[in-house]
């Protein structure tokens, strides 16, 4: 009987040869639990494990605790991988980060952040960052050191209100921090003066709602 | 760790100024207002006013206008609250505490209401001829 | 200008429940926050928006409100609860705060 093969990440799809865009399955580290992600294959040398992205507004992203535990939304639109498996993933080797956006003006930026990882989810998938490059601002967006993550149903913030309450969405939030990709998604023209949008603070400023966003992990040594 | 130290005990004649500084370390002093709460002796707390460290605005209760002026130097993490024409009754602990400005990254001019999470220790003024 | 009011004192024996109360104007439609003040030292939230608690604070300390009274509840008090209580909430009208006159806990022995 033919051995199945199994892959923990876009990294080990691509390098077994397939090298088009798509979603594929992954199997958890250590495990034979699989998840379905999206892989980018051509950006940047490809092999990029796309773990969240929004696009057009159709997936609510106000969600539980466990719902971004486990990941939810289409992986070949809008989704969330999902905490637990990154946080596996991360936890296995060393992982880069990085987050392609899109304004509604047609300018597009980066932040590559040269180490990433999510903490379990027993330290409530904290998230760790080091080495920001990249043109989506010199200060980065995402509160450093890393906040606890947060839902509508497990406040961990550093804020004496309810971030992902007010702001929407699940994120790492600070009190309440410069960041939030899980927010509302506003159209064109109603995508300014929003305190609960779609914001990379130090690439568009207050209010900002962005168009699309694309967060993607990749092994450091890929 | 988080913490607002506030400057020393002040012994003022009536009519004179004194000016309370408020030291802020381990957060970001512009993410947070800063309010003043009183103490008299034996009495129970009274707000005075904030200020809003990212942009300077302040708020004062209407008891204080045109005796209170609120300032802060960002470049040393400090708020300042100065009380003008002093009378024998602003006797009290002056407290300097703060609140999340959670739209901060937001809508900067936005207040939200949230309740003071971390206090000074307080100064003492006493106002005594 | 708005007015919260509070007893002056409440007495409770240890390992018995204290309630504070803090009345006002429609108060059910305002957040309320609790603030512990033992003597010689500066206030400490214990209780915001209405029944949360900040981080350190022990569970036995709850919070209500609804109608024209907020409520502070203390579970099994203990001799270190001794403190006057200090309820506060956000008056819109005027954007100024305002603080209940307090209650002092006094757990008898």
């Known amino acids: 009987k033919e051995e199945q093969i199994s892959f923990r990440d876009c990294a080990e799809v691509f390098k077994s040869g397939h090298t088009t865009n798509g979603i594929y399955t992954l199997t958890f580290p250590n495990s034979t639990e699989e998840i379905k992600a999206y892989c980018d294959m051509e950006a940047g040398g490809g092999g990029w494990t796309i773990i969240q992205r929004r696009e057009d507004g159709s997936v609510d992203f106000q969600r539980t605790w466990k719902e971004y535990k486990v990941g939810f939304g289409n992986p070949s639109g809008e989704y969330w991988l999902g905490n637990e498996f990154v946080s596996q993933l991360t936890n296995q080797q060393r992982y880069v980060l990085k987050i392609h956006l899109k304004d509604w003006e047609g300018n597009e930026a980066y932040s590559l952040y040269e180490h990433f990882y999510l903490s379990s989810e027993e330290l409530n998938y904290r998230i760790h960052l080091k080495g920001l490059t990249g043109t989506a601002g010199k200060i980065s967006s995402i509160s450093q050191p890393g906040n606890d993550f947060s839902t509508k149903d497990g406040d961990n913030d550093k804020c004496i209100c309810k971030c992902s309450q007010m702001l929407t969405g699940g994120w790492w939030f600070d009190a309440c921090g410069p960041s939030n990709l899980n927010g509302m998604y506003y159209p064109q023209r109603q995508n300014t003066n929003k305190f609960n949008g779609i914001k990379w603070y130090y690439w568009k400023g207050s209010g900002y709602s962005l168009k699309a966003t694309t967060m993607m992990i990749r092994p450091a040594d890929f | 760790q988080v913490q607002l130290v506030q400057s020393g005990a002040e012994v003022k004649k009536p009519g004179a100024s004194v000016k309370v500084s408020c030291k802020a370390s381990g957060y970001n002093f512009k993410g947070y207002y800063m309010h003043w709460v009183r103490q008299a002796p034996g009495q129970g707390l009274e707000w005075m006013g904030w200020?809003?460290?990212?942009?300077?605005?302040?708020n004062y209760a209407q008891k204080f206008q045109g005796r209170v002026t609120m300032t802060r130097d960002t470049s040393i993490s400090t708020a300042y609250m100065e009380l003008s024409r002093l009378r024998s009754d602003d006797t009290a602990v002056y407290y300097c505490?703060?609140?999340?400005?959670?739209?901060?990254?937001?809508?900067?001019?936005?207040?939200?209401?949230?309740?003071?999470?971390?206090w000074g220790q307080g100064t003492m003024v006493t106002v005594s001829s | 200008s708005y007015v919260l009011t509070q007893p002056p004192s409440v007495s409770v024996a240890p390992g018995q429940t204290a309630r504070i109360t803090c009345g006002g104007n429609?108060?059910?439609?305002?957040?309320v926050h609790w603030y512990q003040q033992k003597p010689g030292q500066a206030p400490v939230l214990v209780v915001y928006?209405?029944?949360d608690r900040p981080s350190g604070i022990p569970e036995r300390f709850s919070g209500s409100n609804s109608g024209n009274t907020a409520t502070l509840t203390i579970s099994r008090v203990e001799a270190g609860d001794e403190a006057d209580y200090y309820c506060?909430?956000?008056?819109?009208?005027?954007?100024?705060?305002?603080f209940g006159g307090g209650t002092k806990l006094t757990v008898l022995s």
């Open positions: 505490a703060r609140s999340p400005n959670p739209y901060y990254y937001d809508s900067p001019g936005y207040y939200y209401p949230a309740a003071f999470d971390i």
């Open positions: 429609n108060i059910g439609s305002k957040s």
């Open positions: 506060q909430v956000w008056d819109s009208s005027s954007d100024h705060w305002v």
């Open positions: 200020i809003n460290p990212n942009s300077g605005g302040t």
């Open positions: 928006d209405d029944s």
